[in-house]
Interface confidence: low
């Protein structure tokens, strides 16, 4: 057949849904590929083709769509389950065409089973609360476009296994969950389960999201270096390792780039010419405040080498601080040698 | 609820329309199955129309068997030349989860010369 | 075409036994699991009991339960009723959207 865009397959677009409940998928096309949108396309007069591959199989096939209860349905540029089997796992193709036009795009859809605690292999998206920060909520996600506005749907939140109903800190308000005062205990995973009718039949969406308490804005500091600091001289002699660590603790600050580093007379280890290694440890508290430690290592140190400014430096969404090591040579210690008389004898 | 009409004793040759009518269904999303029970024997599936008036039908059924949409709330089953054979209690039942979860109350079909 | 066998065209029982039928496919039914089972009384439709060969439907008590995958099915009634006197039948449905009936076994309960 004739040439068609083929933007191969979008495993950025990792789908995953559970068995035996709707789902609508878009076709990526529009959304990341296209400088158009469904519309536009249609009203152009090109066509959007479903196929699709089945797992650990190399055959395209076309999507059965005259299955009983319309159990799979496209409308516009979305593909329905309603609701998903097992064996739905494969590879999607969404392909728009006309005579003299092509464009497509393959996805991974994976259906996974759940148990009846909601675990499952399905990689769970996380919502950063803050600690002791007044009233914060989460929403149960991806459930637009399942039921019209007109349907109203039950919602049940659960945390862990557990229907959640007289928590002391925690009430269920529809699509919303409501943290009163979020604590450290609040951490765990919340699932919604969202059931609406459709046609005479009743379907489940089933929604978990981890919760993570954090640190607090109010709490929140600039980076405070602990190591290397004014008490600690790092004295050595030539030719031993000389070992700096630069220990910096950043507080939690959603989205802030923590970052750490040397320079050494005031240039980037890569940018000098002397062997030196820098090894990064990272370490969290409950709250997420990040511990950064980088040791700077020589393996076998010069007289220059101890004579150069070595600075650790870090920087965070509340600014940027520097704190310098003090290096020094060590000074030989005296010698000291006994001479003995000659002569001294008994006779 | 879903419900059967047009059952009736009729000779054999004769063609015949058996109704459902539906209610609480919509049919552009609910498939609608008959299966029809010949007097003390068991249940044999004759065919199902699915959302978008697909149809399929039993092997043994095509070709005498018809089932059509006639309305938003109505299945009609046709049946031509009827043979003594076809004398049965005949069921619609709407498609739930995997399952035939709703059915009628059957309309009697006698073949009889 | 596909056959549903139910080896067993009668059972007898007793109130508060167990009764087993089986239901054998002569194909994987559509998914492995897309079998269900009806209880029939005279003069009555059928009457959904078990979906998705394990699934029960609602209002159905829980002394009834179903197993099963592909081709092989079992329907279990346990502490077996006076009221579960009927015949059962297995109904499969298949990658070709054909749907096939067992045919039936009828569970007398003594």
């Known amino acids: 057949s004739e040439r068609c865009d083929d933007w191969g397959l979008d495993t950025m677009r990792q789908i995953q849904v559970f068995e035996d409940e709707p789902a609508r998928i878009k076709c990526p096309l529009f959304e990341h590929f296209l400088k158009f949108n469904y519309s536009t396309a249609h009203s152009a007069g090109l066509t959007l083709i479903w196929y699709w591959t089945r797992q650990d199989r190399d055959l395209e096939e076309p999507i059965n769509f005259r299955l009983p209860e319309n159990r799979i349905s496209k409308e516009k540029d979305v593909l329905w389950f309603r609701p998903t089997l097992l064996n739905d796992t494969g590879n999607y193709t969404c392909m728009l065409r006309n005579t003299t036009y092509c464009s497509k795009v393959a996805f991974p859809l994976e259906v996974v089973q759940k148990d009846s605690c909601f675990n499952s292999p399905m990689k769970l998206p996380v919502h950063k609360l803050y600690i002791e920060y007044g009233i914060q909520r989460i929403t149960c996600p991806n459930v637009d476009g399942y039921f019209p506005s007109s349907v109203k749907p039950t919602i049940t939140w659960y945390m862990g296994c557990y229907k959640i109903q007289n928590f002391n800190n925690v009430i269920p308000e529809g699509m919303n969950l409501s943290f009163l005062i979020a604590l450290i205990s609040n951490n765990g995973n919340y699932t919604c389960v969202v059931t609406y009718p459709e046609n005479g039949r009743t379907f489940h969406l089933t929604r978990t999201l981890t919760v993570k308490v954090v640190g607090s804005p109010k709490n929140a500091v600039p980076p405070v270096i602990h190591s290397p600091n004014d008490h600690v001289v790092y004295e050595k002699e030539p030719g031993e390792e000389l070992l700096i660590p630069c220990t910096v603790y950043f507080s939690f600050l959603m989205d802030s780039r923590n970052e750490v580093w040397w320079t050494i007379d005031g240039k980037k280890p890569d940018d000098i010419t002397i062997d030196v290694t820098i090894n990064e440890s990272i370490s969290h508290s409950r709250t997420e405040d990040e511990t950064r430690t980088q040791i700077l290592s020589i393996k076998k140190v010069t007289s220059e080498d101890l004579k150069r400014s070595y600075v650790c430096h870090a920087r965070s969404a509340k600014g940027e601080v520097a704190k310098a090591a003090k290096v020094k040579q060590k000074v030989p210690a005296p010698r000291y040698t006994v001479e003995l008389a000659c002569g001294f004898g008994a006779t | 609820s879903v419900e059967e009409s047009g059952g009736r004793l009729v000779t054999p040759g004769t063609p015949l329309t058996l109704t459902c009518t539906v209610s609480?269904?919509?049919?552009?999303?609910?498939?609608i199955n008959w299966v029809r029970q010949a007097p003390g024997k068991g249940l044999e599936w004759i065919g199902y129309?699915?959302?978008?008036?697909?149809t399929y039908c039993a092997s043994w059924a095509k070709g005498r068997f018809t089932i059509s949409k006639t309305s938003s709330t109505t299945v009609d089953l046709k049946i031509t030349s009827l043979t003594t054979e076809d004398t049965a209690t005949y069921f619609c039942?709407?498609?739930?989860?995997?399952?035939?979860?709703?059915w009628g109350q059957g309309t009697l079909v006698t073949v009889s010369s | 075409a596909q056959v549903l066998t139910q080896t067993a065209s009668s059972v007898s029982a007793t109130v508060g036994g167990t009764v087993t039928i089986s239901c054998q496919s002569s194909?994987?039914?559509?998914?492995?699991?897309?079998l269900s089972w009806y209880q029939q009384k005279p003069g009555q439709p059928p009457k959904l009991l078990i979906y998705?060969?394990?699934t029960l439907a609602s209002g159905v008590p829980l002394r009834f339960s179903g197993s099963g995958s592909g081709t092989q099915f079992t329907l279990t009634i346990s502490g077996v009723q006076s009221d579960d006197a009927a015949t059962y039948y297995c109904?499969?449905?298949?990658?070709?959207?054909?749907?096939?009936f067992g045919g039936g076994t009828e569970v007398v309960v003594k």
């Open positions: 039942a709407r498609w739930g989860p995997g399952a035939l979860d709703l």
């Open positions: 109904a499969g449905f298949y990658e070709t959207t054909d749907v096939g």
């Open positions: 609480g269904i919509d049919l552009n999303s609910n498939g």
């Open positions: 194909q994987s039914v559509y998914n492995n699991n897309y």
């Open positions: 998705k060969a394990s």
């Open positions: 129309i699915g959302a978008g008036d697909i």
